[in-house]
């Protein structure tokens, strides 16, 4: 079950795990997106452009992700189901300048064991 103040599109179940979508403005060309659970950084993705507009992606925490021109989706395979946790996205903008840092969408996520069980059965 998804609880809290976030837009429900931020969270969706996916193959026994949770997909968390962090949206950002299409105007933004170079960025760093971080996903937090409370104060812990779970995932970090940096998109930059080099010469000839070649895109470089850095994913130092080796998270499963999907990047589009207005969102980064992170896939958590083993979400903490013991208690409700607050997840939020933090966006750092490098282009267009000047540098901006913003905490964006966030919300509480409470996952019941039965949900993961059912999702897992479907996946298997």
């Amino acid at each position: 079950e998804i609880n809290g103040s976030a837009d429900h599109r931020m969270f969706s179940f996916h193959n026994g795990g949770v997909q968390i979508s962090c949206k950002y403005p299409e105007t933004v060309q170079q960025l760093k997106m971080r996903l937090f659970r409370e104060r812990e950084v779970l995932c970090e993705l940096t998109k930059t452009k080099g010469s000839g507009n070649a895109v470089s992606i850095k994913n130092p925490m080796l998270c499963l992700y999907h990047l589009s021109n207005n969102s980064v989706s992170f896939f958590l395979n083993n979400p903490d189901s013991s208690q409700g946790s607050y997840y939020f996205c933090s966006l750092s903008i490098f282009d267009p300048p000047p540098f901006q840092e913003r905490n964006l969408s966030g919300g509480y996520l409470h996952i019941y064991e039965s949900q993961l069980c059912c999702q897992l059965k479907l996946w298997l």
């Epitope: 105007t27 060309q29 267009p96 300048p97 000047p98 901006q100």
Partner: antibody, heavy 125, light 109 residues
Framework: EVQLVESGGGLVQPGGSLRLSCAAS????????MHWVRQATGKGLEWVSA???????YYPGSVKGRFTISRENAKNSLYLQMNSLRAGDTAVYYC???????????????????WGQGTTVTVSS | EIVLTQSPGTLSLSPGERATLSCRAS???????LAWYQQKPGQAPGLLIF???SRATGIPDRFSGSGSGTDFTLTISRLEPEDFAVYYC??????????FGQGTKLEIK
């Protein structure tokens, strides 16, 4: 009242230096990106430099390496250190506030919404 | 590098007429990044329009902005004596971070 007041302009010889100051009041200075924009007599507006809220700085090629923008949030002040001045740097220099906000879906640019009255810099021998 | 070109350089009209000022970008820009300014003799510029079409605080509704991509327009529906001034378009972006058009002088015919 939201206000920007420039000072420090004057006459300087080519190759010389000058430091411009801008005193901000009436708003939370540290929350805004700031710019210097100049205008030579009878000419158009030219962007000179910018500084972000995090202290990151930006310059066009025409002044890069010669001009340095800085800010002192505790004093609500913006500065422009100008070195190796040339005749082509002669202009009125404006201190300008830039307003923008970011949400998860939109990057809103509200334009340069507050301008100072300008300070005149003359580079001549 | 994005270059903004304004036309005409000078526009001669009479009070009560409609003024149409053009700003063309050398490459496509986001409409949210375009602004217009008015400058009267001996004064600092003032913000008129932001986001290509949104009027700044206190700007009369006879001023309107439109356009997208590379072509943007500032329209003054019915000129008042105080509207005769120089108008600049401006964009924020990456290279350079900020640039202005060369200006359009709106003068009394």
């Amino acid at each position: 009242e939201v206000q920007l007041v420039e000072s420090g302009g004057g006459l300087v010889q080519p190759g010389g230096s000058l430091r411009l100051s801008c005193a901000a009041s009436g708003f939370t200075f540290s929350s805004y990106d700031m710019h210097w924009v100049r205008q030579a007599t009878g000419k158009g507006l030219e962007w000179v430099s910018a500084i972000g809220t995090a202290g990151d700085t930006y310059y066009p090629g025409s002044v890069k390496g010669r001009f340095t923008i800085s800010r002192e949030n505790a004093k609500n002040s913006l500065y422009l250190q100008m070195n190796s001045l040339r005749a082509g740097d002669t202009a009125v220099y404006y201190c300008v506030r830039d307003k923008r906000t970011v949400t998860h879906e939109h990057y809103y640019y509200y334009g340069m919404d507050v301008w100072g009255q300008g300070t005149t810099v003359t580079v001549s021998s | 590098e994005i270059v903004l070109t304004q036309s005409p350089g000078t526009l001669s009209l009479s009070p009560g007429e409609r003024a149409t000022l053009s700003c063309r970008a050398s490459q496509s820009i986001s409409s949210s990044s375009l602004a217009w300014y008015q400058q009267k003799p001996g004064q600092a510029p003032g913000l008129l329009i932001f986001g290509a079409s949104s009027r700044a605080t206190g700007i009369p509704d006879r001023f309107s902005g439109s356009g997208s991509g590379t072509d943007f327009t500032l329209t003054i529906s019915r000129l008042e004596p105080e509207d005769f001034a120089v108008y600049y378009c401006q964009q924020f972006g990456s290279s350079p971070m900020c640039s202005f058009g060369q200006g359009t002088k709106l003068e009394i015919k």
